[in-house]
């Protein structure tokens, strides 16, 4: 056993090292450990086949270390892993496309926080058995077409707290059996119409904090089994290109967050669900510093570059933004409910999803909504105090959207076996 | 710096019910899932129940169902545990508590990072 | 529900020594398990939660590992203001359960 760690056998052959002050994977790693734990080191490297004597390893934590650097064949020969831990290495930003093949088993990777600038082609190939995938608060910018195509059984898509800026259509190609994916606190400002195409399983959908000032509902009309939609904190557009998404919502039986509208100003800070159709009228068109709301190619139908309902003659004159108004609708969040829709009472009772740091975030000032986030600025964050998890209404397979713990405190029966959060 | 501020001791009557109340600042109650913790003289450690965020409910361990409520009052950010029936073996140091994974939002660590200093009840007749 | 066990019960300890608490579960709560340090009159302390990650301000001294059902913290080179009792905490579903406590007394 290496001199700073402790090595033992019951329940499983362990090799624990942590917080040691490690700079290096130590040599001497008994060949038959089955879990590594080399967190909270001083690691920036791991050379190639650093554990490929270590054939029954199914758990390996190398989070919170100082990683600049992993070989492409670092993990060679672990045909057995199952958990792969590399968060918190904030140095590591890019990772070799190769590093991960033939990890056959893997079910859960965490990557969150390692300062990633992009994913590389073919860099989760092969991980058919992967069922949770840790990306967020990186530094991604783009999700490359058929990233995850490989990744039928994964059920859970962490991408929160990066700087995407767009959901192009073949992002989440593969992802049959997704049940949670979280895109919020990012930059996003378009998502292609068939972006969510596979996602039939989908529950839990997060796109609260991104520059939505608009979503095509074809993009929502796979999404057969959603149960928790979150679009609070985007610069939403309430005018006529709004009424498909109103109608959407309308009929959405599932939970979902407000939808507070930024533009056109006599709406600024209303819920979009608690609109009448007849209050989705005209258009409101940004212009002078902020960016079109709308970008779509000049047609017969379009010919402005506008949507129909936004041509000249659809338009009602009154509620066109004119050049250089603010498209500022200042704290347009804050209120749960919407003036005049207060519930009576003194507010104590059940909470419900508006409620939820979903649709205030906590900690932090909320900046005027604008249409646009200016570049360069992060989206509003939740304290980093550390990092959070259903079939089983196990906490920890957390998204437990469909299973209702309680009736009242019967705790759930889950088994936590497998990766969640 | 978020604090969990709680009511005075209380001396009650078997039989009767106390309500300890936990007032949150620095932020705001509706952005925090807050759960209770019970804890009696020499003895260790009780999770009684707390609002779970997931499935937006509030949970209860099985011991307690039907003699605690767990309630807020979100115009005064303030989280209220409510317990009847007492008998002299509640007599003891009551909790509330932050939990941690809540505002991670995603990454599910759940734990309970901030504590009230605690809230000491005592039944007796 | 869970049943969290922990070992010793009580351990007595010289100032710079390592000491070992452990804690197992009843079933696989993967590596959803927190560590909590509480001193006599005082709420408990967070020092550890997903099994190994550190919380913010706690010193490099403690360490968690573990995963499925056994999980360890670790004290490496003790100091006399870490005599307290500590109990880990499973927080894979409801009912959260702790486990029973561990005194730790300094020499």
């Known amino acids: 056993c290496p001199g700073a760690c402790v090595c033992y056998n019951e329940p499983k052959v362990t090799t624990s090292c942590p917080q040691q002050g490690l700079q290096a994977v130590p040599v001497g790693i008994p060949a038959a450990s089955q879990r590594i734990f080399l967190h909270g080191n001083r690691i920036s490297h791991v050379p190639a086949a650093s554990f490929r004597a270590c054939r029954n390893l199914t758990i390996l934590w190398l989070h919170s270390n100082v990683l600049a650097r992993i070989d492409a064949a670092a993990f060679t020969g672990l045909a057995l892993l199952e958990q792969l831990d590399l968060s918190d290495n904030a140095q590591l930003r890019s990772v070799d496309p190769a590093t991960f093949h033939g990890l056959g088993r893997l079910h859960t990777l965490h990557l969150d926080r390692c300062g990633l600038q992009e994913l590389g082609p073919g860099l989760f190939r092969g991980l058919a058995a992967l069922q949770y995938l840790y990306l967020q608060d990186n530094a991604l910018q783009a999700l490359p077409d058929d990233t995850f195509r490989d990744l039928g059984n994964l059920t859970h898509l962490f991408l929160h707290g990066n700087r995407i800026s767009s959901v192009p259509e073949r992002a989440f190609r593969g992802l049959h059996s997704l049940d949670r994916l979280l895109l919020h606190q990012n930059r996003v400002a378009h998502v292609h119409p068939h972006a969510f195409r596979d996602l039939g399983r989908l529950m839990t959908l997060y796109l609260f904090a991104n520059n939505l000032s608009a979503l095509p509902t074809e993009a929502l009309a796979p999404l057969r089994a959603l149960q928790y939609l979150r679009l609070n904190d985007n610069p939403w557009v309430c005018d006529c290109r709004a009424r498909p998404l109103w109608a959407w919502l309308q009929k959405f039986r599932g939970s979902s967050s407000e939808v507070p509208c930024s533009l056109p100003q006599r709406l600024a800070g209303r819920d979009l669900k608690r609109l009448a159709a007849n209050d989705l009228q005209g258009c409101a068109v940004a212009t002078g510093p902020y960016h079109p709301i709308w970008t779509g190619r000049a047609t017969d139908e379009e010919p402005l570059g506008l949507p129909k309902c936004c041509q000249p003659d659809a338009a009602d004159k009154a509620s066109v933004l004119e050049p250089g108004r603010p498209a500022s609708a200042g704290n347009a969040l804050k209120g749960r409910v919407p003036p005049g829709d207060s519930p009576p009472g003194n507010g104590s009772g059940p909470r419900h999803i508006n409620d939820s740091p979903f649709g205030t975030l906590p900690g932090s000032a909320e900046p005027p909504l604008t249409a646009v986030r200016p570049e360069g600025s992060e989206p509003p964050g939740f304290p980093t105090s550390g990092p959070r998890r259903r079939p089983g209404c196990s906490r920890k397979n957390r998204t437990r959207s469909h299973c209702r713990l309680g009736q009242a405190g019967s705790g759930g029966g889950g088994t936590g076996d497998s990766e969640g959060s | 710096q978020m604090q969990l501020v709680q009511s005075g001791a209380e001396v009650k009557k078997p039989g009767a019910s106390v309500k300890v109340s936990c007032k949150v600042s620095?932020?705001?109650?509706?952005?925090?899932?807050i759960h209770w913790v019970r804890q009696a003289p020499g003895k260790g450690l009780e999770w009684m129940g707390g609002f779970d965020p997931e499935d937006d409910e509030t949970v209860y361990a099985q011991k307690f169902q039907g003699r605690v409520t767990l309630t807020d009052d979100t115009s005064t950010d303030t989280a209220y545990m409510e317990l009847s029936s007492l008998r002299s073996e509640d007599t003891a140091v009551y909790y509330c508590a932050r939990d941690l994974g809540y505002l991670t939002s995603g990454n599910y660590y759940d734990a309970f990072d901030i504590w009230g200093r605690g809230t000491m009840i005592t039944v007796s007749s | 529900d869970i049943q969290m066990t922990q070992s010793p019960s009580s351990v007595s300890a010289s100032v710079g020594d390592r000491v070992t608490i452990t804690c197992r579960a009843s079933?696989?709560?993967?590596?959803?398990l927190a560590w909590y340090q509480q001193k006599p009159g005082k709420a408990p302390k967070l020092l550890i939660y997903a099994a190994s990650r550190l919380q913010s301000g706690v010193p490099l001294r403690f360490s968690g590992s573990g995963s499925g059902t056994d999980f360890t913290l670790t004290i490496n080179s003790l100091q006399p203001e870490d005599s307290a009792t500590y109990y880990c905490q499973q927080t894979n579903n409801f009912p959260r359960t702790f486990g029973q406590g561990t005194r730790l007394e300094i020499k």
């Open positions: 079933q696989d709560i993967n590596r959803w």
């Open positions: 620095g932020y705001t109650l509706s952005e925090l899932s």
